[in-house]
């Protein structure tokens, strides 16, 4: 960093609250899509190019020209794996965080022409083609079709789908947001025969209603109506099923045949939680209970003589947690051999840290192939020789990311293949793999600007760099950027990380205002080596603000006993570590300790709120954004996972002391800003609200901003421009800022 | 490879009852449906019924009273049962693999004589 | 029953010439429609799935289009393996129903 006189010399621009809002320094990404183990797609100037790995050459898939007759605004397309067809997808319109409805056309690549006969219909809510060839399947008014060729009619596989009651092959609100983090419930067998689809259950889920305003026009606001269970509340039910693709007919209805869950999760509520196919005729399935410390695994083979699905009791597998939840947000998937019969899965061990455990599926122990004060975060890829992982073992950095490769006969040969390759400027990995592994992308994202490279797995040599941002590394040149620290404080002899985005030219000696950027939710993890180009930057850059994040007790990637510090607890220690770390950084010399304030967005809005209402005289303001307030308004799926029921037997106690309204009183020493989108299908508005009313009950004078219409992400381009700009005043202000 | 092989021909009695066989290679019973074709001397196809992958059965008016089309999953065979045989019941009579909705894989066929 | 109606029940041609065979049905049947070949010893492949689909393996030389009630089977540079009687098939609604057949003999 530069000395304070060089502060002055700087005769550099900024990073402005403009700049962030009309993102005018953009990072540039290279999105590939592999379409074979040496081929992959590349969007560049809209025409789409297909690449060659090894050699790096390139050739026109399909010129930008192509559909200039089409008539549509196309957003997205999807190229069959045989790469016969190409699926457009117009007239998006979104619905929650995953789903939206979408119109598709198919185009014919042999003939050069789309396909006008057996469309699929408008408002269709997910389309998907089989693993091999070019079947699809598709999700139209909750009932699943099939298409053996893009010119034949579909086949018909469901016929009970209602709307807000029955989705079969797509989820509902709770599995979409906290189950599957999709709106699809269909997984194609890898060749493609069989089709497995969940179908679920809303009858008795109770509805949240809220109004959307829509246009000045409207004389009476309509009424959503979602059903969504709220903690405690009546959960959807699941049932699955498989339908053998090759049997469809139109003169007959399809058999689905169900495969029913254990015994073990039919004695209570349960959720369908993973699907995996291993092999063309085995499939496994996850299952967890609604008290989620307790899952089971099944493997079902296919019987041909009789056309149905069994699930030996014998190769069932338990996973199950004392100490908290099973898996970070759920059970892990396992990842297969090629014969089926093994399989590769993250678990806690014994230590409570999430390692690598290698299964027979005969067999009920696992042995661990990985070990250490440090996670693996994800399988990345399985060959018959290798295991691809990502882990944040490097350097004992829990905020960063690697990629490694351990050797399936010999577990005690394990390669970093990221770790040196750029260790100043990439520490955060993320990868991307040639169908069969034979290549790979990877991409870092941080501390250094974005880097994209290729690399061969034969090797492991780096091919060719993808995208090295140059143009933005001269443009940021003339740009006065902050700096980030990543370092950790220790507190009850266990290390807790944090970071800070520190202005330019920042000097220790100096006092500068500090905002705590806040989530802390189960898993969460805040510090980390990416970089980014955010509101911190403005604030950093701009106004000398410091912006620092902190992973307290409840916090992921290092272990359950921090993890799991918080179970049944939420809104105690996760809480009392955020206020313990601002008090730590002011005693760090350069903090203005009269200028520290909290803001957090979701979770973090409810910890921002718990922490203005702690009445601990630290935080001179804070922002909630979007804030839980009271853990039995938010979803079932999610809030029971880490505070059990709401009811006297369980853990209704905690569930009344964590609430925000109950820290009223304390509102009268902070300055608070509370801000909500009125359509927010996540955290329903009705959450700031009952803040609202408590606040005014009790006499405190606050700030509040809602958004007409906006939901959990408040992403409209002119709502988005308005809270930054509307929180950013707020921030000066209170810091007495120009 | 797909294979339908018929079996069971022959001369059969006025009134009596017919039993043919179909045995099928390459392709499991319980995901194709196996239909039932026969061809009149000098005449055209006409189709009897089908026994789909899932056990269903649907048959043609023309012989429901008298057809009955069953399977043995384990020995990968299907057949075909005619009662109250008559003489315009003398056919070529073929099993025929049913793929969506086409006939993909037909048998050589068996003919059958109903003389007495 | 939907009925089936080939036409003509027999023709003659020389190698080499372009053949073309209808089919009508008594109702729409939209595209499910199917043709099949019948070798002079009894032996019966599929053609054509879906009024226009080419079965693989089936010689680029048959094509087949129509949908609703009318129908053709074009073979366009006839062939001496081509001797064979053709029927069409609607394959929308129980009982499936096929056409009389069309002969198709050499000149």
């Known amino acids: 960093n530069k000395g304070t006189d060089d502060a002055t010399a700087d005769s550099r621009k900024t990073y402005t609250l403009t700049d962030y809002l009309k993102n005018t320094y953009r990072l540039k990404l290279y999105s590939l899509r592999w379409i074979s183990d040496h081929e992959y797609l590349y969007k560049q100037e809209n025409n789409i190019l297909v690449f060659n790995a090894e050699y790096g050459n390139s050739s026109v898939f399909l010129e930008n020209s192509t559909f200039d007759e089409f008539g549509h605004s196309i957003n997205d397309y999807s190229i069959s794996p045989d790469g016969q067809f190409i699926l457009l997808e117009y007239n998006y319109v979104k619905q929650w965080r995953h789903s939206y409805t979408a119109s598709y056309d198919i185009y014919d690549l042999n003939k050069r022409q789309l396909i006008t006969e057996e469309r699929i219909p408008n408002n269709t809510q997910w389309v998907t083609w089989s693993p091999v060839g070019h079947k699809l399947a598709y999700v139209w008014n909750n009932d699943i079709y099939v298409k053996i060729e893009p010119n034949l009619p579909s086949y018909r596989i469901t016929w009970t789908g209602k709307e807000d009651i029955i989705y079969n092959g797509i989820t509902d609100w709770v599995y979409e947001e906290e189950v599957f983090s999709a709106y699809s419930a269909l997984w194609w067998s890898p060749n493609g025969t069989f089709l497995a689809y969940a179908q679920f259950n809303d009858t008795e889920v109770p509805l949240i209603e809220y109004s959307f305003y829509s246009d000045e026009s409207l004389q009476y606001p309509k009424t959503v109506r979602v059903p969504y269970p709220k903690a405690g509340a009546v959960n959807p039910t699941v049932k699955f099923f498989v339908v053998n693709t090759d049997s469809l007919s139109s003169v007959t209805n399809a058999t689905s045949i169900q495969i029913t869950a254990p015994a073990s999760m039919l004695i209570g509520d349960h959720y369908l939680c993973d699907v995996t196919w291993a092999t063309q005729e085995r499939i496994s399935l996850q299952w967890l209970r609604r008290i989620q410390n307790y899952s089971v695994m099944d493997i079902c083979d296919y019987d041909e003589s009789s056309g149905r699905w069994n699930c030996l009791v014998a190769r069932q597998h338990i996973e199950m947690s004392t100490t908290g939840w099973v898996g970070r947000f759920r059970p892990s998937e396992p990842h297969f051999t090629l014969d089926g019969n093994s399989f590769y899965k993250i678990i806690s061990n014994e230590e409570g840290y999430r390692h690598i455990c290698y299964f027979q599926i005969d067999k009920k122990d696992c042995t661990f192939i990985t070990k250490g004060t440090w996670e693996v975060i994800g399988i990345e890829a399985l060959t018959s020789d290798y295991l691809y992982y990502i882990s944040n073992e490097y350097k004992g950095m829990p905020g960063g990311r690697n990629l490694y490769k351990i050797q399936l006969s010999d577990y005690t040969k394990v390669t970093c293949l990221s770790c040196e390759l750029n260790p100043e400027r990439c520490q955060y990995y993320s990868v991307s793999f040639s169908k069969e592994a034979k290549y790979y992308q990877l991409r870092c994202s941080g501390p250094g600007l974005p880097l994209y490279t290729l690399h061969s797995s034969v090797n492991d040599k780096g091919l060719r760099v993808l995208e090295d941002n140059s143009a933005l590394d001269k443009m940021l040149q003339n740009v006065q950027m902050p700096s980030k620290k990543l370092d950790f404080i220790i507190l009850n002899e266990t290390k807790f990380w944090y970071q800070m985005i520190l202005p330019p030219h920042f000097d220790k000696s100096k006092k500068y205002p500090l905002l705590l950027d806040v989530y802390a939710g189960p898993c969460s993890q805040k510090a980390d080596t990416v970089f980014r180009l955010n509101w911190a930057t403005y604030l950093a850059s701009t106004e000398n603000i410091i912006v620092a994040s902190f992973d307290g007790r409840g916090s992921g990637y290092q272990g359950d006993k921090i993890m799991h510090a918080i179970n049944r607890r939420l809104g105690t220690f996760e809480v009392e570590d955020q206020i313990e770390a601002a008090r730590q950084f002011s005693k760090m010399g350069f903090v203005d300790n009269k200028r520290i304030a909290i803001w957090g967005w979701s979770y973090g809005g409810y910890v921002t709120s718990m922490v203005l209402g702690s009445g601990s005289g630290v935080f001179k303001c804070g922002i909630a954004v979007a804030p839980v307030s009271r853990w039995e308004y938010y979803d079932s799926v999610y809030t029971e996972r880490y505070m059990g029921l709401p009811t006297p037997e369980d853990n209704l106690d905690h569930y009344r002391n964590s609430t925000v309204m109950s820290r009223a009183e304390n509102f009268k020493q902070v300055e608070y800003l509370l801000i909500h989108g009125t359509a927010d299908d996540n955290v329903h508005f009705q959450q700031s609200a009952q803040i609202s009313k408590a606040l005014v009950d009790v006499g405190v004078d606050f700030q509040a901003m809602w958004y007409t219409d906006e939901d959990h992400g408040i992403a409209s381009s002119t709502a988005h421009q308005h809270i930054y700009t509307h929180m950013s005043h707020f921030i000066k202000q209170c810091f007495s800022l120009p | 490879e797909v294979q339908l092989v018929e079996s069971g021909a022959g001369v059969e009695q006025p009134g009596g009852t017919l039993r043919l066989t179909c045995t099928a290679s390459?392709?499991?019973?319980?995901?194709?449906?196996v239909h039932w074709v026969r061809q009149a001397p000098g005449k055209g196809l006409e189709w009897m019924g089908v026994?789909?992958?899932?056990?269903?059965?649907d048959y043609d008016a023309a012989f429901m009273s008298r057809v009955t089309i069953s399977r043995d999953t384990s020995k990968s065979t299907a057949y075909l049962q005619l009662n109250s045989l008559r003489a315009e019941d003398t056919a070529v009579y073929y099993c025929?693999?049913?793929?969506?909705?086409?006939?993909?894989?037909w048998g050589q066929g068996t003919t059958v004589t109903v003389s007495s | 029953d939907i009925q089936m109606t080939q036409s003509p029940s027999s023709l003659s041609a020389s190698l080499g010439d372009r053949v073309t065979i209808t089919c009508s049905a008594s109702?729409?049947?939209?595209?499910?429609l199917n043709w099949y070949q019948q070798k002079p010893d009894g032996a019966v492949k599929l053609l054509i799935y879906y009024s226009s689909n080419l079965h693989s393996g089936v010689p680029s030389r048959f094509s087949g289009s129509g949908s609703g009630t009318d129908f053709s089977l074009t073979i366009s540079n006839l062939e001496p393996e081509d001797i064979a009687t053709y029927y069409c098939q609607q394959s929308i609604k129980l009982p499936f129903t096929f056409g009389s057949g069309t002969k198709l003999e050499i000149k």
């Open positions: 025929v693999r049913n793929r969506h909705d086409w006939f993909d894989y």
């Open positions: 026994i789909w992958g899932d056990g269903r059965t």
């Open positions: 390459g392709f499991s019973l319980t995901t194709y449906g």
């Open positions: 109702q729409g049947i939209r595209n499910s």
